[in-house]
Amino acid sequence: DAEFRHDSGYEVHHQKLVFFAEDVGSNKGAIIGLMVGGVVIA
Protein backbone atom coordinates (compact mmCIF):
# COMPACT_ATOMS: atom_id res chain seq x y z
CA ASP A 1 0.00 0.00 0.00
CA ALA A 2 1.11 3.54 -0.65
CA GLU A 3 2.33 5.73 2.16
CA PHE A 4 1.21 9.31 2.66
CA ARG A 5 2.95 12.20 4.40
CA HIS A 6 0.58 14.56 6.18
CA ASP A 7 1.91 18.09 6.76
CA SER A 8 0.57 19.94 9.74
CA GLY A 9 -0.89 23.10 8.20
CA TYR A 10 -4.27 22.93 6.52
CA GLU A 11 -7.48 24.80 5.86
CA VAL A 12 -10.89 23.41 4.94
CA HIS A 13 -12.86 25.12 2.17
CA HIS A 14 -16.13 23.71 0.86
CA GLN A 15 -15.24 20.24 2.14
CA LYS A 16 -11.86 20.14 0.51
CA LEU A 17 -8.63 20.12 2.44
CA VAL A 18 -5.81 22.24 1.10
CA PHE A 19 -2.42 21.27 2.47
CA PHE A 20 0.39 23.75 2.91
CA ALA A 21 3.86 22.26 2.82
CA GLU A 22 6.11 23.29 5.70
CA ASP A 23 9.90 23.52 5.86
CA VAL A 24 10.45 22.92 2.17
CA GLY A 25 12.27 26.11 1.26
CA SER A 26 10.86 28.01 -1.68
CA ASN A 27 7.85 25.66 -1.86
CA LYS A 28 6.58 26.82 1.53
CA GLY A 29 2.89 27.56 1.22
CA ALA A 30 2.35 25.55 -1.94
CA ILE A 31 -0.94 23.69 -2.34
CA ILE A 32 0.00 20.02 -2.50
CA GLY A 33 -3.21 18.05 -2.36
CA LEU A 34 -6.88 17.38 -1.70
CA MET A 35 -7.98 15.19 1.15
CA VAL A 36 -10.71 12.59 1.39
CA GLY A 37 -11.07 11.01 4.81
CA GLY A 38 -7.59 10.28 6.09
CA VAL A 39 -5.85 10.27 2.70
CA VAL A 40 -4.33 13.08 0.67
CA ILE A 41 -4.18 12.91 -3.13
CA ALA A 42 -1.42 15.22 -4.31
Epitope: H13, K16, G38, I41
Partner: antibody
Protein backbone atom coordinates in the same frame (compact mmCIF):
# COMPACT_ATOMS: atom_id res chain seq x y z
CA UNK B 1 -27.45 19.32 -7.17
CA UNK B 2 -24.48 16.99 -7.49
CA UNK B 3 -24.80 14.80 -10.59
CA UNK B 4 -22.42 12.19 -11.96
CA UNK B 5 -23.52 10.90 -15.36
CA UNK B 6 -21.73 7.74 -16.44
CA UNK B 7 -21.39 6.27 -19.91
CA UNK B 8 -23.49 3.33 -21.03
CA UNK B 9 -23.05 -0.45 -20.75
CA UNK B 10 -20.17 -2.19 -22.51
CA UNK B 11 -19.92 -5.72 -23.92
CA UNK B 12 -16.31 -6.62 -24.63
CA UNK B 13 -14.11 -9.54 -25.64
CA UNK B 14 -11.38 -10.91 -23.36
CA UNK B 15 -8.13 -9.02 -23.85
CA UNK B 16 -9.86 -5.82 -24.90
CA UNK B 17 -9.68 -2.43 -23.19
CA UNK B 18 -12.48 -0.02 -22.32
CA UNK B 19 -12.66 3.62 -21.20
CA UNK B 20 -15.63 4.59 -19.02
CA UNK B 21 -16.59 8.23 -18.57
CA UNK B 22 -18.24 10.19 -15.78
CA UNK B 23 -19.47 13.73 -16.45
CA UNK B 24 -19.80 15.88 -13.32
CA UNK B 25 -22.19 18.77 -12.75
CA UNK B 26 -23.57 20.77 -9.84
CA UNK B 27 -20.26 21.44 -8.11
CA UNK B 28 -16.80 22.87 -8.70
CA UNK B 29 -15.04 19.94 -10.36
CA UNK B 30 -11.53 20.85 -9.18
CA UNK B 31 -12.56 21.12 -5.51
CA UNK B 32 -13.13 17.39 -5.03
CA UNK B 33 -11.39 14.10 -5.64
CA UNK B 34 -13.02 11.61 -7.99
CA UNK B 35 -13.00 7.89 -7.26
CA UNK B 36 -14.02 4.63 -8.91
CA UNK B 37 -15.57 1.54 -7.32
CA UNK B 38 -16.18 -1.99 -8.56
CA UNK B 39 -19.18 -4.12 -7.65
CA UNK B 40 -19.21 -7.69 -8.93
CA UNK B 41 -22.64 -9.32 -9.40
CA UNK B 42 -24.39 -7.49 -6.58
CA UNK B 43 -21.73 -8.37 -4.04
CA UNK B 44 -19.63 -6.01 -2.01
CA UNK B 45 -17.76 -2.96 -3.18
CA UNK B 46 -14.09 -2.43 -3.94
CA UNK B 47 -12.33 0.91 -4.18
CA UNK B 48 -10.20 1.07 -7.33
CA UNK B 49 -8.57 4.45 -6.83
CA UNK B 50 -8.99 8.20 -6.84
CA UNK B 51 -7.74 11.24 -8.71
CA UNK B 52 -7.15 14.90 -7.89
CA UNK B 53 -8.61 16.85 -10.83
CA UNK B 54 -6.32 19.83 -10.20
CA UNK B 55 -3.05 17.98 -10.67
CA UNK B 56 -4.08 14.69 -12.23
CA UNK B 57 -2.42 13.03 -9.23
CA UNK B 58 -3.72 9.56 -8.52
CA UNK B 59 -3.80 6.94 -5.81
CA UNK B 60 -4.65 3.31 -6.56
CA UNK B 61 -5.66 0.25 -4.67
CA UNK B 62 -2.66 -2.03 -5.20
CA UNK B 63 -5.04 -4.72 -6.45
CA UNK B 64 -6.02 -2.56 -9.45
CA UNK B 65 -2.82 -0.67 -10.25
CA UNK B 66 -2.09 -2.85 -13.32
CA UNK B 67 -5.74 -2.96 -14.38
CA UNK B 68 -7.05 0.61 -14.21
CA UNK B 69 -5.86 4.06 -15.26
CA UNK B 70 -7.68 7.15 -13.98
CA UNK B 71 -7.66 10.47 -15.84
CA UNK B 72 -9.69 13.67 -15.95
CA UNK B 73 -10.51 16.36 -18.51
CA UNK B 74 -11.03 19.57 -16.55
CA UNK B 75 -12.45 21.46 -19.54
CA UNK B 76 -15.36 19.03 -19.90
CA UNK B 77 -15.58 18.23 -16.15
CA UNK B 78 -15.25 14.54 -16.95
CA UNK B 79 -13.46 11.74 -15.13
CA UNK B 80 -12.34 8.63 -17.00
CA UNK B 81 -11.30 5.13 -16.07
CA UNK B 82 -9.58 2.85 -18.56
CA UNK B 83 -9.56 -0.90 -17.88
CA UNK B 84 -7.13 -3.04 -19.85
CA UNK B 85 -6.49 -6.72 -20.60
CA UNK B 86 -10.06 -7.53 -19.70
CA UNK B 87 -11.04 -10.97 -18.40
CA UNK B 88 -14.30 -12.40 -17.11
CA UNK B 89 -13.17 -11.33 -13.61
CA UNK B 90 -13.56 -7.73 -14.73
CA UNK B 91 -17.26 -8.16 -15.48
CA UNK B 92 -18.94 -5.87 -12.93
CA UNK B 93 -20.75 -2.62 -12.36
CA UNK B 94 -18.30 0.26 -12.04
CA UNK B 95 -19.30 3.37 -10.12
CA UNK B 96 -17.84 6.82 -10.45
CA UNK B 97 -17.97 8.72 -7.15
CA UNK B 98 -17.07 12.12 -5.77
CA UNK B 99 -15.16 12.21 -2.50
CA UNK B 100 -15.39 14.91 0.15
CA UNK B 101 -13.16 15.84 3.06
CA UNK B 102 -15.45 14.02 5.49
CA UNK B 103 -14.63 10.85 3.64
CA UNK B 104 -17.92 9.79 2.13
CA UNK B 105 -18.93 9.56 -1.53
CA UNK B 106 -21.60 10.76 -3.94
CA UNK B 107 -22.26 8.04 -6.51
CA UNK B 108 -22.97 7.90 -10.22
CA UNK B 109 -25.56 5.49 -11.58
CA UNK B 110 -23.02 2.82 -12.50
CA UNK B 111 -21.74 1.35 -15.76
CA UNK B 112 -22.14 -2.34 -16.47
CA UNK B 113 -19.10 -3.94 -18.10
CA UNK B 114 -19.54 -7.47 -19.43
CA UNK B 115 -16.56 -9.45 -20.70
CA UNK B 116 -17.50 -12.48 -22.73
CA UNK B 117 -15.98 -14.46 -25.57
CA UNK C 1 -8.21 -2.76 6.62
CA UNK C 2 -10.74 -5.61 6.66
CA UNK C 3 -14.33 -4.61 7.46
CA UNK C 4 -16.41 -7.42 8.97
CA UNK C 5 -20.16 -6.92 8.90
CA UNK C 6 -22.68 -9.05 10.80
CA UNK C 7 -25.16 -10.45 10.18
CA UNK C 8 -25.02 -11.16 6.44
CA UNK C 9 -28.80 -11.36 6.34
CA UNK C 10 -31.29 -9.77 8.72
CA UNK C 11 -34.93 -10.82 8.41
CA UNK C 12 -37.23 -8.29 10.13
CA UNK C 13 -40.89 -7.44 10.47
CA UNK C 14 -41.98 -3.93 9.60
CA UNK C 15 -41.86 -1.79 12.73
CA UNK C 16 -39.08 -3.87 14.30
CA UNK C 17 -35.75 -2.49 15.43
CA UNK C 18 -32.76 -3.66 13.40
CA UNK C 19 -29.10 -3.58 14.37
CA UNK C 20 -26.08 -4.16 12.14
CA UNK C 21 -22.51 -4.51 13.39
CA UNK C 22 -19.32 -3.50 11.60
CA UNK C 23 -15.84 -4.25 12.94
CA UNK C 24 -12.56 -3.12 11.44
CA UNK C 25 -9.26 -4.98 11.63
CA UNK C 26 -7.57 -1.83 12.96
CA UNK C 27 -8.61 1.44 14.55
CA UNK C 28 -10.32 3.92 12.25
CA UNK C 29 -9.43 6.95 14.34
CA UNK C 30 -7.39 9.40 12.28
CA UNK C 31 -4.65 11.55 13.79
CA UNK C 32 -6.94 14.61 13.88
CA UNK C 33 -9.49 12.71 15.99
CA UNK C 34 -11.97 12.04 13.19
CA UNK C 35 -13.23 8.52 12.59
CA UNK C 36 -14.04 8.03 8.92
CA UNK C 37 -16.60 5.23 9.17
CA UNK C 38 -19.71 5.52 7.03
CA UNK C 39 -22.92 3.61 6.28
CA UNK C 40 -24.63 3.24 2.88
CA UNK C 41 -27.88 1.64 1.74
CA UNK C 42 -28.10 0.09 -1.70
CA UNK C 43 -31.49 -0.84 -3.13
CA UNK C 44 -31.79 -3.29 -6.06
CA UNK C 45 -30.66 -1.76 -9.34
CA UNK C 46 -29.51 1.47 -7.68
CA UNK C 47 -26.23 2.98 -6.56
CA UNK C 48 -25.41 3.12 -2.84
CA UNK C 49 -26.82 6.11 -0.96
CA UNK C 50 -25.18 7.62 2.09
CA UNK C 51 -27.03 7.28 5.39
CA UNK C 52 -24.47 8.05 8.10
CA UNK C 53 -20.98 9.53 7.90
CA UNK C 54 -18.19 9.77 10.45
CA UNK C 55 -19.81 7.14 12.70
CA UNK C 56 -22.92 9.01 13.78
CA UNK C 57 -23.76 12.04 11.59
CA UNK C 58 -26.96 11.55 9.61
CA UNK C 59 -26.73 12.73 6.02
CA UNK C 60 -29.24 15.36 4.91
CA UNK C 61 -32.71 13.92 4.36
CA UNK C 62 -32.03 10.68 6.24
CA UNK C 63 -34.81 9.93 8.74
CA UNK C 64 -33.96 10.03 12.44
CA UNK C 65 -34.91 6.38 12.85
CA UNK C 66 -31.38 5.71 11.54
CA UNK C 67 -28.58 6.11 14.07
CA UNK C 68 -24.91 5.21 14.11
CA UNK C 69 -22.64 4.62 17.06
CA UNK C 70 -19.30 3.12 18.03
CA UNK C 71 -15.64 4.02 18.28
CA UNK C 72 -12.20 2.72 17.43
CA UNK C 73 -12.90 -0.45 15.51
CA UNK C 74 -16.42 -1.43 16.62
CA UNK C 75 -19.48 0.24 15.09
CA UNK C 76 -23.24 -0.24 14.93
CA UNK C 77 -26.06 0.98 12.72
CA UNK C 78 -29.54 0.91 14.28
CA UNK C 79 -32.91 1.36 12.61
CA UNK C 80 -35.47 2.04 15.31
CA UNK C 81 -38.61 1.12 13.35
CA UNK C 82 -38.06 -0.60 10.02
CA UNK C 83 -40.16 0.65 7.11
CA UNK C 84 -40.61 -0.96 3.70
CA UNK C 85 -38.37 1.66 2.07
CA UNK C 86 -35.48 0.59 4.33
CA UNK C 87 -35.12 -2.82 2.70
CA UNK C 88 -31.92 -3.43 0.78
CA UNK C 89 -28.22 -4.03 1.42
CA UNK C 90 -26.36 -2.00 4.03
CA UNK C 91 -22.61 -1.45 3.70
CA UNK C 92 -20.16 0.03 6.14
CA UNK C 93 -17.11 1.75 4.69
CA UNK C 94 -13.88 3.19 6.01
CA UNK C 95 -11.90 6.05 4.48
CA UNK C 96 -9.33 6.53 7.23
CA UNK C 97 -6.74 4.28 5.59
CA UNK C 98 -5.88 3.58 1.96
CA UNK C 99 -6.99 1.42 0.31
CA UNK C 100 -10.53 2.39 1.29
CA UNK C 101 -12.59 -0.69 2.11
CA UNK C 102 -16.20 -1.80 2.51
CA UNK C 103 -17.97 -4.42 4.58
CA UNK C 104 -19.46 -7.41 2.78
CA UNK C 105 -22.98 -6.08 3.23
CA UNK C 106 -26.04 -6.92 5.30
CA UNK C 107 -29.29 -7.71 3.48
CA UNK C 108 -32.30 -6.37 5.35
CA UNK C 109 -35.36 -8.33 4.24
CA UNK C 110 -38.92 -8.99 5.37
CA UNK C 111 -39.26 -11.96 7.69
Amino acid sequence: EVQLQQSGPELLKPGASVKISCKASGFTFTDYTMHWMKQSHGKSLEWIGGINPNSGGTIYNEKFKDKATLTVDKSSRTAYMELRSLTSEDSAVYFCTRGVYDGYFYWGQGTLVTVSA
Amino acid sequence: VVMTQTPLSLPVSLGDQASISCRSSQSLVYSNGNTFLHWYLQKPGQSPKLLIYKVSTRFSGVPDRFSGSGSGSDFTLKISRVEAEDLGIYFCSQTTHAPFTFGSGTKLAIK
